[in-house]
Interface confidence: low
Amino acid sequence: AVDLTLLANLRLTDPQRFFLTCVSGEAGAGRGSDAWGPPLLLEKDDRIVRTPPGPPLRLARNGSHQVTLRGFSKPSDLVGVFSCVGGAGARRTRVIYVHNSPGAHLLPDKVTHTVNKGDTAVLSARVHKEKQTDVIWKSNGSYFYTLDWHEAQDGRFLLQLPNVQPPSSGIYSATYLEASPLGSAFFRLIVRGCGAGRWGPGCTKECPGCLHGGVCHDHDGECVCPPGFTGTRCEQACREGRFGQSCQEQCPGISGCRGLTFCLPDPYGCSCGSGWRGSQCQEACAPGHFGADCRLQCQCQNGGTCDRFSGCVCPSGWHGVHCEKSDRIPQILNMASELEFNLETMPRINCAAAGNPFPVRGSIELRKPDGTVLLSTKAIVEPEKTTAEFEVPRLVLADSGFWECRVSTSGGQDSRRFKVNVKVPPVPLAAPRLLTKQSRQLVVSPLVSFSGDGPISTVRLHYRPQDSTMDWSTIVVDPSENVTLMNLRPKTGYSVRVQLSRPGEGGEGAWGPPTLMTTDCPEPLLQPWLEGWHVEGTDRLRVSWSLPLVPGPLVGDGFLLRLWDGTRGQERRENVSSPQARTALLTGLTPGTHYQLDVQLYHCTLLGPASPPAHVLLPPSGPPAPRHLHAQALSDSEIQLTWKHPEALPGPISKYVVEVQVAGGAGDPLWIDVDRPEETSTIIRGLNASTRYLFRMRASIQGLGDWSNTVEESTLGNGLQAEGPVQESRAAEEGLDQ
């Protein structure tokens, strides 16, 4: 089963202190990349139990293996179904926690009910706040059954479900009629897919006999152990305050696992931690009881004492769950409950035993899942035990499963089952990814999806020049970091492949597919210098530069000119794509701007050193607009324009430009120069009779200035069609200039 635990902190009087934490003991859990599996998800499931909307809950990730949900603001936020999803691929597993309001009218005597197929399930809702109304039972949010309030037995409403089948699984609730759903008692019914003690597709396989309240998984036959127990059959107790499949997790806080509810993958469901009981998991076990929810009884014999976390603690000379076995009976010692090997390896497995008479080599045997019996190849005899060593033939996937070490002497026999997991070394499904390249190095992301089993312990990158027969170069890297391949040849293609390894002997997988990565061309080394520049207008600049003379061909594809406008914080880049070019015209610049200018040689994507910068000030733009423009028709073909000079001129005006356009016309406007800037009047001739015209004008110094306001005027009536407008300035009657 997936090592996934959902913890609920049950100190409930202040919802803001309530939290749910999902912890994964899976290798590489929750990192969220293709290679390392999808992330842990922890959320409230509002499909069945809907609560009033509140502020969004806060999700905090603590590393890759833990996610916590906080931010509950009111009691009703807590009521309902929460789920955590973890594990990758076919192992993706959902763990469910059902939360009941401690102030509800009805409370479940037991929230989680795990039953076998065909059993009778009995759900019991205890009256907490009595209402003299019917009780409605629902299954997965739909009406199921009604009980009259007189039908309460000993202050409890019971729902009996005979001959349950897996589809009966789900969330059940008991609610007083017309009461808020938040006052319901919520239950979770888990129906195993097989009858008691059986598992597998046809329920033909026998469960291993899970101890200490462990539940046999109906799909894979593994024991899902209660919090605080470990081992193939949950035979081993964790130290107080620890949980997880290998006891690797620790309960938060100084009071250990008090006040915490633990939810594990189905078919286990939820319970208090070992040594605790009660609806809030805050009550210690009564004397003689131990384990999750204090469901187990010690019944210690031969002077054993009951520990509420681990069960019977046996005096010297005795062992067994109830201290019922004399140390004279042979006993398998310190056998790991789970071993992991890589496919096609030939591991050695040790099995140690003690007893009186003393076990010898021939009295210890190892049995594989297919029934094959292996005899030990050698034994190490020590004063207190005999250790038999077994050489296992080359492992195949079918060897995964429960193995058994058995010792037999005249004093009796003992056996210990343990799980062997045969893992497939990982093989990359994709080539590594090129992140950046330079002329002598490549930066590569080795993180790729893979087939086979994690966790990934090492990543090897193999690389060599393309089409080369030389040996591959190899670099061992951290699985989560990018790799820089150094000291490469410029402008060269390299074949790059990833090899992944998992822990243990024989954990190296096959090489992944190759990819071609090419180093960049060499960096250009020549530094140009700016020979000069010339302002060709308020927004135009001609720049020229030179390069030092060096022997051999020029390493470069062109030049990059950079203009930096410090006032506006803007950079302009101009690409000159010929390496022979030594001059460029820059247009569209901002008049009146102070630019810093430099030039660089480029080759492929690489830039050479920049020239020493030059500082260029473009002249400001043209003058302000002429003032008080006025138009007056003189005849059927002439209109006189008058104006006043612009104010605050930066220099002498060189000319005016008049724009003429027929009002409402679709044609382009006509521009007419007034070359005598001292004038403040001009006559536009050659206009059409009875036609409405639009006029505006602007002045020019080094550049054209702003347009004046637009004025309208119509020529006088019924003249002949003119050839087109012309203008005449006062005191310039002969110099017509179209």
Epitope: T13, S73, K74, S76, P102, S180
Partner: antibody, heavy 117, light 107 residues
Framework: EVQLLESGGGLVQPGGSLRLSCAAS????????MSWVRQAPGKGLEWVSS????????YYADSVKGRFTISRDNSKNTLYLQMNSLRAEDMAVYYC??????????WGQGTMVTVSS | DIQMTQSPGTLSLSPGERATLSCRAS???????LAWYQQKPGQAPRLLIY???SRATGIPDRFSGSGSGTDFTLTISRLEPEDFAVYYC????????FGPGTKVDIK
Amino acid sequence: EVQLLESGGGLVQPGGSLRLSCAASGFTFSHYKMSWVRQAPGKGLEWVSSIYPSGGWTYYADSVKGRFTISRDNSKNTLYLQMNSLRAEDMAVYYCARDRPGAFDVWGQGTMVTVSS
Amino acid sequence: DIQMTQSPGTLSLSPGERATLSCRASQSVSSSYLAWYQQKPGQAPRLLIYDASSRATGIPDRFSGSGSGTDFTLTISRLEPEDFAVYYCQQYGRSPSFGPGTKVDIK
């Protein structure tokens, strides 16, 4: 600042009715269960009634069941207590309180209800 | 319903002394759902302790609560002048109910 302000108290004859209001401010009223608690002159505290955030779940002390009705208007941040068939033993200072849940962490200043002929 | 009793009815002490107030429930209070309040004349009650032992926001650490099941205690480690008042306990495991109160006055 979190505040509760009761109003609506006064003098009423036995058998009469009165409606108390409690205006809440400084917190998200619609997230909290609210309650009424009363205190007869010179006596201890007595819980009267509570209402859950949605308003759908209400409950009452046996002494007022059937006569008093608690309600709330979350859009107005206001809690109400409709008191009918008032008796002499209902005379008390009525406090509105925020419920966290069960323990009352914020109280109003109280409003006096006098039942006398 | 659960009945709450408090003892003593009045406790006469001097500033600086330790005050121990008792509260007993007629039946077990589920999950230690018990609160303590302080009330001064003409004022509304003020929450001191909830969940039997958790101090409410802004309450000085000289106030502490303990107990479970049916027996609960409020301790004021060192009485300050402003601590002389009436103290009520309240259970909220079922329909809420208050104790009759203990008056702490100056000796």
